[in-house]
């Protein structure tokens, strides 16, 4: 029987470092090895018939035990599939190796209205583009961490909001007078130093009632 396997199905490595993606196989008399890269809608061939393809040959080397990168960039993050088949036969096996290139978060950008109407919906956003793996976001009001569930803390029990740590979106619905304050957010991805945005003041104002 044939086996294709990697003892490291997930590899995490800081950007600009060398890395090896392992692929061990047995039971093949004349193995033909291919490596495929997948990231979202992108699929590329890294290695075909035991040879590194032209687009990778300057920085990737084929070894009998895997492929080795001289230096990885954030664009290399994705799933690599090692596919082994018998030359001229029908034996086949494959293994997937997930590569996560670690990049610290950059300073997040916030979109916070300077004023919003009490009783209405107010949307605050926080995002940063560099972090790998993608950052999770924590919101602060007047320097105090906002819990995911406002009802869980006395300080926020009068607020009505939904906070999504993955997207960085903070939605007040409805906005109340007590939501006036200085808001900032922090991005962290478990690698490097967490980064904090600028603080922006949001005023919760009464609805203008026409005479």
């Amino acid at each position: 029987s044939v086996t294709v396997h990697s003892s490291e199905p997930e590899v995490r490595i800081p950007e600009n470092n060398p890395v090896k993606l392992s692929c061990a196989y047995s039971g093949f008399s004349s193995p033909r090895v291919e490596w495929k890269f997948d990231q979202g809608d992108t699929t590329r061939l890294v290695c075909y018939n035991n040879k590194i393809t032209a687009s990778y040959e300057d920085r990737v080397t084929f070894l009998p035990t895997g492929i080795t990168f001289k230096s990885v960039t954030r664009e290399d993050t994705g799933t690599y599939t090692c596919m082994v088949s018998e030359e001229g036969g029908n034996s086949y096996g494959e293994v997937k190796v997930k590569l996560i290139v670690l990049v610290p978060p950059s300073k997040p950008t916030v979109n916070i209205p300077s004023s919003a109407t009490i009783g209405n919906r107010a949307v605050l956003t926080c995002s940063e583009q560099d972090g790998s793996p993608p950052s999770e976001y924590t919101w602060f009001k007047d320097g105090i961490v906002m819990p995911t569930n406002p009802k869980s803390t006395r300080a926020f029990s009068n607020s009505s909001y939904v906070l999504n740590p993955t997207t960085g979106e903070l939605v007040f619905d409805p906005l109340s007078a007590s939501d006036t304050g200085e808001y900032s957010c922090e991005a962290r991805n478990g690698y490097g130093t967490p980064m904090t945005s600028n603080a922006v003041r949001m005023e919760a104002v009464e609805r203008n009632v026409g005479v």
């Epitope: 003892s7 490291e8 090896k20 392992s22 061990a24 080397t61 070894l63 009998p64 035990t65 001289k70």
Partner: antibody, heavy 116, light 106 residues
Framework: EIQLVQSGAEVKKPGATVKISCKVS????????MYWVQQAPGKGLEWIGY????????RYNQKFKGRVTITADKSTDTAYMELSSLRSEDTAVYYC?????????WGQGTLVTVSS | DIQMTQSPSSLSASVGDRVTITCKAS??????IAWYQQKPGKAPKLLIH???TLQAGVPSRFSGSGSGRDYTFTISSLQPEDIATYYC????????FGQGTKVEIK
């Protein structure tokens, strides 16, 4: 014949650093990752970390991270493991081992004794 | 991390006896288990990999079986030269050794 030959026994004081070597022969050094495994007295075997000799890429077991450095010299087919800030619990036999998927060939082991 | 629970920690058997050692993984390891023999003052020696594949030159009295989380290593007829400590190793995801089984002769 595949061989992994390690440097001799070491006696070190707490806080010191030790560097162990592992010279290989009988196969292409850069084709296989080289691992280091600790065996403390009366305890089991635990992987410390490894190096891909082709490009110098390393990975360390979280338990040893920060105190261990693994390097390789392709010109001499030799791998090295350096362990710093030694303490009494680092007294152990340290092995280098070649990895295919499991560990198929091992060095003879190097005894490191940490004692004041 | 995957944990490996090896039992027994030691055993005593007579020459010619059948000896069985077990390793239980904390999760399914998909048959990626190896067995090693270590004699005093020596490095571990690979006997079996991928549950039951015998390394070249290893006597056929050594065998392995199992699947999922449960694996067994057997010496069909214990010989005096088999006195050693035996370890299992899971290599499905990173590497974890069992605690070892010391085999002695009665």
């Amino acid at each position: 014949e595949i061989q992994l030959v390690q440097s001799g026994a070491e006696v070190k004081k707490p806080g010191a650093t030790v560097k162990i070597s592992c010279k290989v022969s009988g196969y292409s050094f850069t084709d296989y990752s080289m691992y280091w495994v600790q065996q403390a007295p009366g305890k089991g075997l635990e992987w410390i970390g490894y190096i891909d000799p082709y490009n110098g890429g390393t990975r360390y077991n979280q338990k040893f991270k920060g105190r261990v450095t693994i390097t390789a010299d392709k010109s001499t087919d030799t791998a090295y493991m350096e362990l710093s800030s030694l303490r009494s619990e680092d007294t152990a036999v340290y092995y280098c081992a070649r990895q295919t998927d499991y560990f198929d060939y091992w060095g003879q082991g190097t005894l490191v004794t940490v004692s004041s | 991390d995957i944990q490996m629970t090896q039992s027994p920690s030691s055993l005593s058997a007579s020459v010619g006896d059948r000896v069985t050692i077990t390793c239980k993984a904390s999760q399914d390891i998909n048959n990626y288990i190896a067995w090693y023999q270590q004699k005093p003052g020596k490095a571990p020696k690979l006997l079996i990999h991928y549950t039951s594949t015998l390394q070249a030159g290893v006597p056929s009295r050594f065998s392995g079986s199992g699947s999922g989380r449960d694996y067994t290593f057997t010496i069909s007829s214990l010989q005096p030269e088999d006195i050693a400590t035996y370890y299992c190793l899971q290599y499905d995801n990173l590497w974890t050794f069992g605690q070892g089984t010391k085999v002695e002769i009665k």
